[in-house]
Each structure stands twice: as C-alpha cells, then as structure tokens.
C-alpha cells in the first residue's frame, strides 16, 4: 500500500498532501480509514479536505489515524493512504526523535537548511529560526524565503534546527513548527580523469650525461580521498621494474598532496649516473584512477656541461 | 529502441496455470504504468490487467480473482499469473506501455509483439 | 462499463480518397481536465496494434499527417486524409476514462 508518514503537534496546523499524485483538476476524495466515514470539504470543520491536501487546524492527538486518499483520475482510481500522528506538545526543549524531519548535511560552501514540509502552507516571511531551542541571532543567520542560510559553518553549528511560521486560512492563524538535524561534513569529494601536470606532454628534458637526472611524474585526480588512484614511470613501455636497469629507480612511496584542495601524486623518478643510452628511451609519465589513464610521453636531450653566456 | 518483448506463452489445460513476462528496454520502466491487452483469433482487443507506478493493479470482472498483475522494476519486468485459465481465455496477450507518471497520458504507445496463449483439453 | 461502438465494421477504400470511421462512447469521454480520453489504434494485418491518435485529437510520434482524430464528449472521428495501401489493417477506438474498453473494430481494405 502507498502510505505516507505524517506528523504534528496538539494546537498546532497540519497539512498532509495525498501521497498519490494528480492534476490540480482531478477529484479527490478524503476517508478516515478506521470508519471508512468521509472527510468534510467545508472549511468550517476543524479537519477538512481541500483537494490533494488534507487540513488540520489545528490538530488535536485523537486525530492521529490512517487516512485514505482516493485521486479521481482518468484510467484508474489512485489510492494512497496517510498515515498522521498527532504528538502532545513537550514540556521542555527536546525535540524527540519521532518529531524530526530528515537530516540535513552542510559545508563551508553549502549550509541551506530548508523548513520541511512548509510548501504546504500558506505562509508569510519572515520564518522564525532556534536551535536546541534558543532563538538564532547574529550576523552569520540569514532566514531567506524557506530556508535558513548559515554564514562561514562550523563543526559547532550542528544540531537540531527549528522553523517556526504561521499558517493562514480564511483570516485565522494557526501556528507550525518543524525541526531537523543538521551535521557538517567536510566539501564532498569528487572524482575525474587523471590531469598531468607535469611533465608536459612530449618535454624534452636536458641532463648531463654522467650526472644524475630527477623527472617527476605529478598528476590530479579529484577532490578528497581517491579509492582508485596512481602515478607511476615506463621505460619504452615496460615497467621499471622489468626494465632491469639497476641505475633508474622510482621513488618508493607516492606523495599525496592536496593542492587547491585537489588530491594529487607525484612519483619520482631518479637515473644516476646518466649514459648516452639513456637518451635513446622514451620516458612515460602514466596517470590511472577508474575514469582511465593518461599518459605523458618525456625524452631526454644532453645538456652541454659549459653553457657559455655572452 | 523502446522495446517489450513477451513470453511464457503456450499450451494448457482448462483450470491450469500459466505466467507471462514482459522485458521492458529503452526507457524508465518505473515511471509507467504496465498492462496486458488479449486478443483472440479473428477478435478484437480486451484489456485484461493494469499495475501503475506503486504496484497498485487493476482487473475488469472478467479476470478478478483468477489473474495477478506485478512488476519487478529492477528487472524492467511485468507479470501476468493466470491461474485457473477457460478456454474463453485462448487470445494473443500484449505486453502494453501506459500511462507516464500517475497522470501524463500519451495513450498505449509502445506494445510489444504478444504471446499465444492456448487453452484447451 | 463505458461501451464502444465503431462503425462502420468494413470499410473499402480506394487509394487517394478521403476515409472516415466513427466511434461512440455510452457515456462523455470529456474529463475535468479538459482531454478527451479517446484513443484511435491501428492493427495491419499480422502486426501489434501501434497508437494513431491519443487524448481524442494528438497525433502519436512517427505518424503522418493524414491522420487526424476530432470530437468530443460521446462521438469521435478518425479521418485519413488521403487512403495509402499501407494504411489497411483493423482500427480501434478505446476510452481511458474508466478502465480501458476498446471498440469492435472498423476493418479497412482497398476496394
């Protein structure tokens, strides 16, 4: 059966919408499930049927009950069922469990918390904010149209929010609260295909031949922590370690560095003692996470060891 | 290519049982609802289930109680149990796409090819 | 139920000419939403059905515009404009009102 949690406080507003969808057009009819008895359209009665919507104003705890929403439309009846709850309204500040709305996370960049559940209503800004029951001032709170917007989040912003607004209907006001969670986290992570910073594509790299010679490999490959993610050299095509040249060796270990908050690797690459035969191999720089693998392809070049500058 | 391809079609006996499938591809199969239209011989066409988007399912008389509708989304497929089967039920059933989202009707757009269905002793 | 009627049952045609079929509804196929829930359907011979017209009067994908589908409430029409030989096969009003009834079905072939 489709059914659709609902809850709210005694002397409190509720709205539910039917949880089957319909056009504005299309008929539907309101039940009390245990009863089978019809909800009333006419607005006098405290709880009445306004098309998808089912209204409470305000809600008392005996209403709490399954009801049955049947969506007139062409081919076939949709039926859903709501399933409403009314609470006793809590002496102190905690807001228990059953009354929260779903968590929401946010960040630095991100920290909208959104009233749940007020597009129901027929409200006018501005929204009043707490947490853990303390009425939100300061610069940093911006209520903005439906949402609350949290200036500069830190780890100590978490908790439970509250909105409070009022409902309007035919001139009488009838108040509403909602609370949910938020947590920080940090910037969610991401991932993309490899991007080489160095060395460039196709470099010719300058040694002097009976020196040693450094190229580094350094690739991005995201934000945040990579699962799948890895820089390393090949000697035409093979592996370092199957190239059997004791004189070239990768640097054992990737350093993981996070620039612009971007998750990046070098992989070193050392030739002691460099040799004419040196020059005649083809370096690559491969760069590999999950999307795939780039590659930069380096050659080295002899570096007269007098350079002489007029 | 948006596609339905019945089976499980075949021979049986009167008061036997038989089970359809549809392989639904090339489109989001959950957003839709799914029916079955028959066809006997040399007949016209007779809808005989529906299943909307929350496995709610819909019968004419002629089948209530004796059919069953399901759907199992992440298999892009539709059922159709026939249980206790006449040989008023011999036809050629079709796999039929439907209504879009509860309420954007485009009519039956996609049908598949059918499966035949033979009941007799 | 809402019933069909669709006539005529047989239709000859010849290549070129208009052609007209009709279909009535027992009870008013106009719903709140302002749509006809009517539908026209064509069956060739040794195929599925495959949807002309939906809503009474909106031309299906891939459709040419010979066909056109009008009225509302209880009496519909689906015209062809022009008759091609590939146009034979049995067409089907249906109403998605209430449930799904089809018509009987109007058999066109070429003269």
């Known amino acids: 059966k489709f059914s659709k949690q609902s809850w709210g406080l005694e002397n409190e507003a509720l709205i539910v919408r039917c949880p089957r969808q319909g056009k504005p057009s299309y008929t539907v009819d309101w039940y009390y499930s245990q009863t089978n008895k019809s909800i009333p359209t006419q607005e006098r009665n405290r709880v009445f049927a306004s098309g998808q919507l089912l209204k409470f104003l305000p809600a008392a705890v005996a209403d709490s009950g399954i009801y049955t929403c049947i969506v007139r439309s062409p081919t076939f009846n949709r039926t859903g069922y709501a399933n409403v709850t009314i609470y006793k309204k809590q002496s102190d500040c905690n807001v228990p469990d059953y009354l929260m709305y779903s968590t929401v996370s946010g960040s630095e960049k991100n920290s909208k918390i959104y009233c749940p559940t007020i597009d129901l209503y027929n409200w006018t800004a501005p929204l009043e904010w707490f947490k853990n029951c303390q009425a939100l001032q300061g610069s940093r709170y911006r209520a903005h149209k439906s949402f609350l917007v949290i200036d500069n989040v830190m780890t100590e912003d978490a908790g439970d929010y509250t909105c409070k607004f009022i409902h309007n209907e035919n001139g009488a006001n009838y108040s509403v609260t909602a609370t949910r969670s938020f947590t920080v986290k940090d910037e969610q992570g991401f991932s993309l295909f490899p991007v080489i910073g160095a060395p460039a594509q196709n470099e010719i790299k300058e040694v002097e031949i009976g020196k040693n010679a450094n190229l580094t490999c350094s690739a991005c490959f995201g934000k945040g922590t990579q699962f799948l993610a890895a820089v390393l050299w090949q000697l035409n095509g093979t592996k370092i370690t199957d190239f059997g040249e004791p004189r070239i060796q990768q640097e054992e270990g990737q350093n993981q560095s996070f620039s612009n908050g971007l998750a990046c690797l070098d992989m070193v690459l050392r030739i002691a003692d460099v040799k004419e035969e040196d020059l005649l191999l083809q370096y690559d720089c491969l760069a590999l996470n999950l999307h795939g693998l780039r590659r930069h392809t380096v050659r080295l070049s002899r570096k007269n060891p007098i350079d002489h500058h007029s | 290519e948006v596609q339905l391809v019945e089976s499980g079609g075949g021979w049986v006996q009167p008061g036997g049982s038989l089970r359809l499938s549809c392989a639904a591809s090339g489109f989001t199969f959950s957003s839709y609802d799914m029916y079955w239209v028959r066809q006997a011989t040399g007949k016209g066409l007779e809808w005989v289930s529906g299943?909307?988007?929350?496995?709610?399912?819909y019968y004419p008389d002629s089948v209530k109680g004796r059919f069953t509708i399901s759907r199992e989304n992440a298999k892009n497929s539709v059922y159709l149990q026939m249980n206790t089967l006449r040989a008023g039920d011999t036809a050629v059933y079709y796999c039929?796409?439907?209504?879009?989202?509860?309420?954007?009707?485009?009519?039956?757009?996609?049908w598949g090819h059918g499966t035949t269905v033979t009941v007799s002793s | 139920d809402i019933v069909m009627t669709q006539s005529p049952l047989s239709l000859p045609v010849t290549p070129g000419e208009p052609a007209s079929i009709s279909c009535r509804s027992s009870q008013s196929l106009l719903y709140s939403d302002g749509n006809n829930y009517l539908d026209w359907y064509l069956q060739k011979p040794g195929q599925s059905p495959h949807l002309l017209i939906y809503l009474g009067s909106n031309r299906a994908s891939g459709v040419p515009d010979r066909f056109s589908g009008s009225g509302s409430g209880t009496d519909f029409t689906l015209k062809i404009s022009r008759v091609e030989a590939d146009d034979v096969g049995v067409y089907y009003c249906m109403q998605a009102l209430q449930t799904l009834t089809f018509g009987g079905g109007t058999k066109v072939e070429i003269k």
């Open positions: 299943i909307d988007t929350v496995g709610d399912t």
């Open positions: 039929v796409r439907g209504i879009y989202g509860d309420f954007y009707y485009y009519g039956l757009d996609v």
